[in-house]
Interface confidence: low
């Protein structure tokens, strides 16, 4: 009679994770008498995948009854894999011996390859809002993917970005991989209402790529323009000066009216106007008193943006032009002067 | 000026539907989130979830998964919130308010309200 | 989900006082936090946004202050339209959530 032979018809098995993988052997006689055990890896390393024998092993199922007598097929299932699972599995015959069983013959090997689908890319941006023309980086990372082959790709608002460096790790064999990749992008004033993509490619994903997403309404801040202008009041010795504070993101506005450099009021901006590009408009207003002044009055709009040092606009009204028997102001002027 | 119009008063018998309404006016339907927010008969606020109106997705807050569904029509800047299957535990007044997104570090306050909408449940 | 506790639950005053209500968030949530006054068979009014800024048309009596877990509202020189029932609410993190609510009733 021949000489038992393990047979492994597979080379190479590739399984998702998550998913079982069946691991093929047979054996071609019933002689020598004794238990098949599998192992992943070669050598005194190995490890003891299942024990025909003895032992528990509760992720691994076989595929047909090893308690019948004539039986010679020693394919096992592995339930739930993960990368971690990745390697050469050996299914090994052993003789029956005493006291122990002694090794007779191994299979050629079987490599397990785990598809793991990369997670979905998360994308963070820069911790502090910055301002139009600056540059900014993002960065997209992406992990516990396998085989290591991965594109990524960076778009803003649907154009493919260039600026941007990638890096997988690791760099040698590993069960599972992570990317990591950084993109320079420069922001513009339309930008509150611009997205960056970053999209991820691989095997597992069948085409149809994984995208992260940052808005940058949570990294640009485009600062307000102020322009102050006298409005004619019909009310006697009144004037009404406005400060327009235009173009600015995010809302979190102040606004202090100061009155020959004391605080006359202070406001907050909350119902705004909304521009198509996303930025805000906001008007507020101050009704002057001019008969409660005996000389010029210099009136400063103070605008604290999100935080950053106030801008300031003045306007000087001529108290001389106001005399208190007329309504007129005529000779009110502004000087358009701009204060940091 | 900005507003937010609901409809009226409902009374429903349980295991009726009910679809309330929410009227916006003064701004644009789309640039705002809409959150409905619910008060129980002499209790506080509890927020029910929000339709981005942008996209028309909506979120749902844990409890409010199922029998609640929140939707809108732009054509006419409305939305709406569906109840099916009531229950007399859902008897309360029925809150819509606006936020200006979620981006921005003022992003779930929120700054308009409806006048609110009375649903009662009895049978 | 994050717990917002008021405290107190109601108070009595007198028109001309200050008073302070107290919200204490069960985690961080930076400024994230609103204020919001209600008049019975009324809907809820935005007072204060990001802890501290008043809405416009807000009277300069009411301010927000805090921040992380602690936060305040102080009302002073109440008026009598200021009887009314506040609530605090975080916009940190979903679920959006509110306090309990505080009463406040006249003297």
């Known amino acids: 009679e021949e000489e038992l032979q393990v047979i492994q018809p597979d080379k190479s098995v590739l399984v998702a994770a998550g998913e079982t993988a069946t691991l093929r052997c047979t054996a071609t006689s019933l002689i020598p008498v004794g238990p098949i055990q599998w192992f992943r890896g070669a050598g005194p390393g190995r490890e003891l995948i299942y024990n025909q024998k003895e032992g528990h092993f509760p992720r691994v199922t076989t595929v047909s009854d090893l308690t019948k007598r004539n039986n010679m097929d020693f394919s096992i299932r592995i339930g739930n894999i993960t990368p971690a699972d990745a390697g050469t599995y050996y299914c090994v015959k052993f003789r029956k011996g005493s006291p122990d069983d002694v090794e007779f013959k191994s299979g050629a090997g079987t490599e397990l390859s785990v598809r793991a689908k990369p997670s979905a890319p998360v994308v963070s941006g820069p911790a502090a809002r910055a301002t139009p023309q600056h540059t900014v980086s993002f960065t997209c990372e992406s992990h516990g993917f396998s085989p290591r082959d991965i594109t990524l790709k960076w778009f803003k608002n649907g154009n493919e970005l260039s600026d941007f460096q990638t890096n997988v790790d690791p760099v040698g064999e590993s069960v599972s991989y992570s990317i990591h990749s950084t993109a320079k992008v420069v922001l513009t004033r339309e930008d509150v209402h611009s997205q960056v993509i970053c999209e991820v490619a691989h095997v597992t994903l069948q085409g149809d790529p994984l995208r992260g997403t940052a808005n940058l309404s949570e990294t640009i801040r485009v600062p307000p323009t102020l322009e102050v202008t006298q409005q004619p009041v019909r009310a006697e010795n009144q004037v009404n000066v406005t400060c327009q504070v235009r173009k600015f993101y995010p809302q979190r506005l102040q606004l202090t009216w100061l009155e020959n450099g004391n605080v006359s009021r202070t406001e907050t901006a909350s119902t705004v106007t909304e521009n198509k590009d996303g930025t805000y408009n906001w008007m507020s207003w101050l009704l002057v008193n001019v008969s409660a002044h005996r000389d010029d009055v210099k009136l400063t709009c103070q605008v604290e943006h999100d935080g950053q040092p106030a801008v300031s606009k003045s306007h000087d009204l001529k108290v001389s032009a106001h005399p208190k028997e007329q309504g007129s102001n005529t000779a009110a002027e502004n000087t358009g002067s701009n204060e940091r | 000026q900005i507003q937010l119009v609901q409809s009226g008063s409902e009374l429903k018998k349980p295991g009726a539907s009910v679809k309330v309404s929410c009227k916006a006016s003064?701004?644009?339907?789309?640039?705002?989130?809409m959150n409905w927010v619910r008060q129980a008969p002499g209790q506080g606020l509890e927020w029910m979830g929000f339709?981005?109106?942008?996209?028309?997705?909506?979120t749902y807050a844990q409890g409010f998964k199922g029998r609640f569904v929140f939707s809108l029509d732009t054509s006419v800047s409305t939305a709406y919130l569906q109840i099916s299957s009531l229950k007399a535990e859902d008897t309360a007044v029925y809150y819509c308010?606006?936020?200006?997104?979620?981006?921005?570090?003022?992003?779930?306050?929120?700054?308009?309200w409806g006048q609110g909408t009375l649903v009662t449940v009895s049978s | 989900d994050i717990q917002m506790t008021q405290s107190p639950s109601s108070l009595s005053a007198s028109v001309g006082d200050r008073v302070t209500i107290t919200c204490r968030a069960s985690q961080n949530v930076g400024t994230h936090l609103a204020w919001y006054q209600q008049k019975p068979g009324k809907s809820p009014k935005a007072l204060i946004f990001s802890a501290i800024y008043r809405y416009i048309g807000v009277p300069s009596r009411f301010s927000g202050s805090g921040s992380g877990t602690d936060f305040t509202l102080t009302i002073s020189n109440l008026q009598p339209e200021d009887f009314a029932t506040y609530y605090c609410?975080?916009?940190?993190?979903?679920?959006?959530?509110f306090g309990q609510g505080t009463k406040l009733e006249i003297k």
């Open positions: 003064g701004y644009s339907i789309t640039d705002y989130a």
């Open positions: 339709i981005n109106t942008y996209t028309g997705e909506p």
């Open positions: 609410q975080q916009y940190n993190t979903y679920p959006l959530t």
């Open positions: 308010a606006r936020t200006r997104g979620y981006y921005d570090f003022d992003g779930g306050a929120f700054d308009y």
